[in-house]
Amino acid sequence: NKILVKQSPMLVAYDNAVNLSCKYSYNLFSREFRASLHKGLDSAVEVCVVYGNYSQQLQVYSKTGFNCDGKLGNESVTFYLQNLYVNQTDIYFCKIEVMYPPPYLDNEKSNGTIIHVKGKHLCPSPLFPGPSKP
């Protein structure tokens, strides 16, 4: 038996930050679980981890180069990624493992979310604007 995961197909980070919500076909309340976010088509780079446990507060881990926070819903984990760089534009996959209570469960691979990080293109205002027209 596998947990199903739903993610937005695409998110655009205009301000170098994005909220990626991973929605599960499973209630995480009072469970011990490990939710993670993986970068790349092959999910090779794990960038964020949220560890949840019925007896202690949520623990969030960010890989060096990523600034990540996590929020828990009954059937979701939302990863809040900040200070993203244009070169971190990629596809990101949500994963989940539930360890307790038994049985151990994990997810079917999701379709992923393309996060498109838009660079900040600030148009400099001219220092000496020309004379205003009457």
Partner: nanobody, 124 residues
């Protein structure tokens, strides 16, 4: 809950070698990292080395690079620290740590569980 049991360590002459082991037991996820830290008298606990689950990524403190090697046996849930060319400044209590992060983290705060500690003493 994860338990870590360390073995190895002891007294060795400068230039000698030692091997530390740390076995993890309890509820384990499919991906986690383990690392070694050390604490000398009157000093903070400092990072030594860490390795990720897939064993394709390891990180070392500059002071031990080229002398220490971290490895792990996933079938046994055990991590090892091979220490060669030991120096008196390597004298410390060595602790293994377990983190739910999947990468070889050097951040002490990332580690959730700790072993009981093993004394390593290097004589000049």
């Amino acid at each position: 809950e994860v338990q870590l049991v360390q073995s190895g360590g002891g007294l060795v002459q400068t230039g000698g070698s030692l091997r530390l082991s740390c076995a993890a037991s309890g509820r384990m996820f499919s991906n986690y990292a383990m690392g070694w830290f050390r604490q000398a008298p009157g000093k903070e606990r400092e990072f030594v080395a860490a390795i990720n689950y897939r064993r394709d990524s390891a990180d070392y403190a500059d002071s031990v690079k080229g002398r220490f090697t971290i490895s792990r046996d996933n079938a046994k849930n055990t991590v090892y620290l091979e220490m060669n060319s030991l120096k008196p400044e390597d004298t410390a209590i060595y602790y293994c740590g377990f983190t739910y992060a999947g990468w070889a983290s050097s951040r002490r705060d990332d580690y959730n569980y700790w072993g009981q500690g093993t004394q390593v003493t290097v004589k000049p």
